[in-house]
Interface confidence: low
Amino acid sequence: MLFSSLLCVFVAFSYSGSSVAQKVTQAQSSVSMPVRKAVTLNCLYETSWWSYYIFWYKQLPSKEMIFLIRQGSDEQNAKSGRYSVNFKKAAKSVALTISALQLEDSAKYFCALGE
């Protein structure tokens, strides 16, 4: 049985021409993996803020957004259950790994940036 995760490009509050530009980019459009394996979803961001959080959300078919995990800019790599983050501040990269994949993990995943 295949796990099929559709990953959307999501740009979070990008203020063009402002000195407080925030930008979040997810380059993968979709990823398919077998159950019980792990998948890593990449997210790159830009920010002029010096203290911030990156959030990962899962969107259900009903469009409801479920919060998964939060990574602070001053914190060690976050981990919560089957979700873990590989945070590389210098590279402005915050990748989400979902381990032991289940069929219910099939969804859209969003990366967002905030204070």
Epitope: F13, W50, D74, E75, Q76, G114
Partner: antibody
């Protein structure tokens, strides 16, 4: 461009109240906490408190609890600080600031005098 | 009233900041920051978390220190550097607190 535009100078009587405003533009107002800072020659810079405009949640410096009330109007992207029961000790310049990006208003001077 | 530090243009200036308790957060970071306030202006961030220069801040500004003792160095003072320098901490919040300030002025 991010801007925090504060209201003009205030001259108020002892015992009265005053409300200062801080209009934000150039960023998503509800996403970032608005902080207020008091400055006097004697005490320097003092953090009054902060408000999360998205949720209305506030945090105050114990020293200013009951003195300052922080609110916000999301529709106009404006933060407010009401100062109550004013005395000469409240005479100061008050700044609003979106702290973790280092954006500050120009400051509002409050003078309490009879 | 801020302390006064008279300097000559082109000289190095060192401004110190001492905390009554360690500013090392439980997450390992030290939230000690430096601001410059020029006359008639609001404060502007120079250095955050001890040694990180904020965007647009010239490299003649550097921060160092650990625990309770911190220093801001200006390698070659220029006229535009004059003003009051404040340290501030956000390790133990609320409240976010500031030092009393050091006024950098021409000797």
């Amino acid at each position: 461009q991010v801007q925090l535009q504060q209201s003009g100078a205030e001259l108020v009587r002892p015992g009265a109240s005053v409300t200062l405003s801080c209009k934000a533009s150039g960023y998503k107002f509800i996403d970032y906490e608005m902080h207020w800072v008091k400055q006097t020659p004697v005490h320097g810079l003092e953090w009054v408190g902060d408000l999360d405009p998205g949720t209305g949640v506030t945090a105050y410096n114990q020293k200013f609890k009951g003195k300052a009330i922080l609110t916000a109007d999301k529709s106009s992207s404006t933060a407010y600080m009401e100062l109550r029961s004013l005395t000469s000790e409240d005479s100061a310049v008050y700044y609003c600031t979106v702290w973790s990006a280092d954006f500050w208003g120009q400051g509002t001077s409050v003078t309490v005098s009879s | 009233t801020p302390l006064s530090l008279p300097v000559s243009l082109g000289d190095q200036a060192s401004i110190s900041c001492r905390s009554s308790q360690s500013l090392v957060h439980s997450n390992g970071n030290t939230y000690l920051h430096w601001y410059l306030q020029k006359p008639g202006q609001s404060p502007k961030l120079l250095i955050y978390k001890v040694s990180n220069r904020f965007s647009g801040v010239p490299d003649r500004f550097s921060g160092s220190g650990s625990g309770t003792d911190f220093t801001l160095k200006i390698s070659r003072v220029e006229a535009e550097d004059l003003g009051v320098y404040f340290c501030s901490q956000s390790t133990h919040v609320p409240p976010w607190t500031f030092g009393g300030g050091t006024k950098l002025e021409i000797k």
